[in-house]
């Protein structure tokens, strides 16, 4: 309606004696500015006077001055928009209607506001969500329809009379729409909060109690249970009986079902609050709890760990690691189910007790071949001693041990024999798979670990073998000690150092490079004739007749070896010279006569000289002197001389007779 003034403010305001009231208010006049304002208490319109009667709490004048007695009430507004009011302090008799009489130049308006002032501070109001469940966060709200700038208040939350630790968020509203103070508390209730009293307490600025509101919490929760066990420590021996009782300490709403669980799995046909276990076995050891359900869900008790004690079971041995390499470390672990845990262990190796080993683990820092075998153990606890289990096998791997090269042949071995050797070893793990031989040769291996040397050489000195599995172990080399006839027999001239001249002292040595066995005999021969049995052949004064082809033989028990033929050469001056005549020593004149100087010399004669009966040298230097035609005056005695590098020799005289031919005689 356009003929109305427009006001906005809370419909009713609430306060209590001695507090204050703050009235937020806005308006819009029909025309112009506000010229007059009167605040009435319970105004009533007087038709006769056409004016409002009632107590005037506040009155403004045109000059804007306010009488001093009106200071309790303050108009905080203005001439065109704001009509906010404050009453401080407010009194009980201020309750009722407040009338705001507004006048402009041409228009008038009466606006009514309800004021409710109580004798004492009124309580706030707690608002709860429709349902509260344990552990789910909820917001508790405490609302008080009061706020006034001049009268500070606070709202505090209490649980069972004790201030709550959670931080509350307080907010105030002083608007034309609403006036209130609100405190909000975020809270995660637990099942134990069910039935507890929550209080919102109104306090003044000094913390003095003014009023409060209380509610009882209805926290929906799963059943809360307590489990009781007999015996109380839940430790029993096999064959004993155990009773467990489930008590519901709280449930909201009421519980509907009950069940029992062992190690998280439901036990069938156990739906009462008592669980009776008769003559328990070790398999019944475990974690027990009871479960009770309601509409919220299932609730579980704490777990009871039932320990059924028993003597150790037959033990098993775990080996870290098998197979083990010799020299490595190995750990043995004795495993035996027992309750309580075993306190003592007895260890066995191949059935024999291992002294001093009383712990769950046995550590061997350096494994040796004889550590191999079966390891077993016995565990012991307060209830008894377990049985020895089957044990575990430790396999110790190592290179072949005590490898030897063995000669299979009868001794001695002779050059050219076929030699068989075997490679032997004492033990090996894993088994030997191959063999190696040193030195390498084109030899035959007829079977594993056997070597055959055909036609063994005199110089095959030592052989070594290795037996190999994952590793190779070498034997010490074995000497074949091959026996052979003397080798490299040769004749060597010891003296003279230079060439041999007739008359020299001569020594020949029979040399050889090696012989096995070392004991030897010597033989010298010339032209098949035995000359001596020493290593040396000596000539005190060599003669040309000693020249020739010499051999020496060296023999041992295996055989004999001859040297190559060695030629002995004796150097001598020409000897045994003679002049031979051809066709004879009597030649007819006119014929041909040849004189030859024959000699024995080494080296051969290199130069000849011919002499006549007068010892006159003739101008001829070859071996033959040819007279052609021969004359009677050539008759006479001739001799020759031969020369070589060693010396000279001369022949005796030889006479040539030249006789007259029949023609010459005929002429005479």
């Amino acid at each position: 309606d356009s003929s109305k003034w427009v006001f906005e403010h809370p419909e009713t305001l609430y306060a209590w004696e001695g507090a204050c009231v703050w009235i937020p208010c806005t308006y819009r006049a029909l025309d112009g500015d506000l010229e007059s304002f009167i605040l009435f208490h319970n105004p009533e319109y007087n038709k006769n006077t056409s004016k409002f009667d009632g107590t005037r709490l506040y009155e403004s004048t045109k000059d804007g001055k306010v009488p001093s007695e009106q200071k309790r009430v303050q108009f905080l507004g203005d001439k065109n928009k704001n009509c906010t009011l404050s009453i401080h302090p407010v009194h009980l008799n201020d309750s009722g209607q407040l009338g705001l009489r507004m006048e402009s130049k041409t228009e008038k308006w009466m606006e009514r506001i309800h004021l409710n002032v109580s004798e004492r501070p009124f309580p706030p109001h707690i608002q709860l969500p429709p349902e509260i469940q344990e552990s789910q966060e909820v917001t508790l709200t405490c609302l008080l329809n009061f706020s006034c700038y001049g009268y500070p208040i606070q709202l505090q939350w209490l649980l069972e009379g004790v201030p709550m630790r959670q931080a509350a968020v307080t907010s105030t509203s002083l608007t034309i729409k609403s006036v209130f103070t609100r405190s909000e508390l975020k809270f995660s209730p637990q099942w134990s909060h069910h039935g507890k009293i929550v209080t919102c307490q109104l306090q003044d600025a000094d913390g003095k109690f003014l009023s409060n509101d209380t509610v009882q919490l209805n926290v929906k929760h799963t059943p809360k249970l307590e489990i009781k066990v007999t015996p109380s420590d839940a430790i029993v021996r096999e064959g004993d009986s155990v009773t467990m009782t489930c008590e519901v300490s709280s449930s909201n709403p009421e519980y509907t079902t009950v069940s029992w669980l062992k190690d998280g799995t439901s036990l069938k046909k156990q739906n009462t609050f008592t669980l009776n276990l008769r003559e328990v076995t070790k398999d019944q050891s475990g974690k027990y709890c009871c479960q009770v359900s309601n509409d919220v869900g299932p609730g579980r008790s704490e777990e009871v760990f039932l320990q059924v004690q028993y003597a150790p079971e037959p033990s098993t041995v775990q080996i870290l690691h098998s197979p083990a390499v010799e020299g490595s470390q190995v750990e043995f672990l004795c495993m035996s189910l027992a309750n309580p845990l075993p306190t003592n262990y007895t260890w066995y190796h191949n059935g024999k007790e291992m002294q001093g080993r009383t712990e769950e683990k046995v550590h061997i820092p350096k494994i040796l071949p004889w550590h191999a075998g079966t390891y077993s153990c016995v565990a012991e606890n307060i209830l008894g001693t377990g049985q020895r289990g089957p044990g575990a096998e430790l396999d110790v791997q190592y290179p072949p041990k005590k490898v030897t090269t063995v000669i299979q042949n009868p001794m001695p071995i002779r050059e050219g024999d076929t030699v068989t050797l075997s490679c032997n070893y004492n033990s090996s793990n894993p088994s030997v798979t191959r063999y190696e031989w040193k030195p390498h040769g084109a030899w035959e291996e007829p079977s594993l670990g056997v070597l055959k040397i055909q036609n063994v050489g005199w110089d095959n000195t030592t052989i070594a073998c290795a037996a190999c599995n994952s590793w190779c172990s070498w034997a010490s080399p074995v000497a074949l000690n091959v026996q052979y006839a003397p080798r490299d027999v040769r004749v060597r001239k010891i003296k003279p150092l230079s060439e041999i001249h007739s008359g020299n002292s001569v020594s020949l040595q029979c040399d050889f490079s090696s012989s096995h066995p070392k004991e030897v005999q010597f033989f010298w021969e010339k032209n098949g004739r035995l000359l001596g049995k020493e290593s040396q052949l000596n000539f005190d004064s060599i003669s040309p007749e000693d020249a020739g082809s010499y051999s020496c033989w060296v023999n041992n028990s295996i055989g004999q070896t001859a040297s190559k033929a060695w030629t002995l050469e004796v150097l001598y001056a020409p000897r045994r010279l003679r002049v031979s005549m051809s066709p004879g020593d009597q030649v007819m004149e006119g014929k041909s006569a040849t004189l030859t100087c024959e000699s024995d010399a080494n080296p051969p004669v290199s130069h000849y000289t011919w002499f006549d009966w007068n010892n006159q040298s003739l101008p001829y230097h070859s071996q033959k002197l040819r007279l052609e035609p021969v004359k009677v005056q050539h008759s006479g005695a001739y001799w020759c001389q031969g020369t070589n590098s060693v010396g000279k020799g001369r022949s005796p005289l030889s006479t040539l007779t030249v006789y007259y031919s029949p023609e010459t005689i005929g002429r005479r």
Epitope: Q329, H349, K352, M354, Q355, G356, R357, T358, E359, V362, H363, I364, P365, K366, L368, W370, H371
Partner: antibody, heavy 117, light 106 residues
Amino acid sequence: EVQLKESGPVLVKPTETLTLTCTVSGFSLTSYDISWIRQPPGKALEWLGVIWTGGGTNYNSALKSRLTISKDNSKSQVVLTMTNMDPVDTATYYCVPHYYGYAMDYWGQGTTVTVSS
Amino acid sequence: EIVLTQSPATLSLSPGERATLSCRASQDINKYIAWYQQKPGQAPRLLIHYTSTRQTGIPARFSGSGSGRDYTLTISSLEPEDFAVYYCLQYDNLLTFGGGTKLEIK
């Protein structure tokens, strides 16, 4: 490198108690047993007792009442205590490591103890 | 307790000769026997363990044999440095030393 060092008094009076300490390095007392051995001057070696890896002990029956062997694995130390010492106990005392199935291959220089008033 | 008896107490030999030392146990010791060499002023030195296994670095002239109760240490050809006292040790059941054999130069 395995090392053993025996230490203790050089001279002990008759009736007194001898305490010798063996400090080891290069191996752990949780892996090796330790035996104590002695040798009087000019006489044979005599085994006194052993402390096993697990801490158990065994003693030479002739000396059992007088001997105690203990150890501290963390300190790598073994202690021999011998009560009521007599001049015949004058000897060189050795601590020696060994383990199951293996003889003693590491010997320290030993410590010579003389019992005299 | 196991008792070990060594024989002879003294053995007089020349370098190059063969030495045979004996050790007899009062019961079967399952080959768990070791042999030690000791020279004056020195700690014992392990030669052989587990009856016949030569310790690393021990010359091949030293060898061990035996089983059950009877065990032997053999030195195939004596060297001058081999003259010393030799002890056997059983480690089958606790530990026991023999009384020793003195090997001296003849």
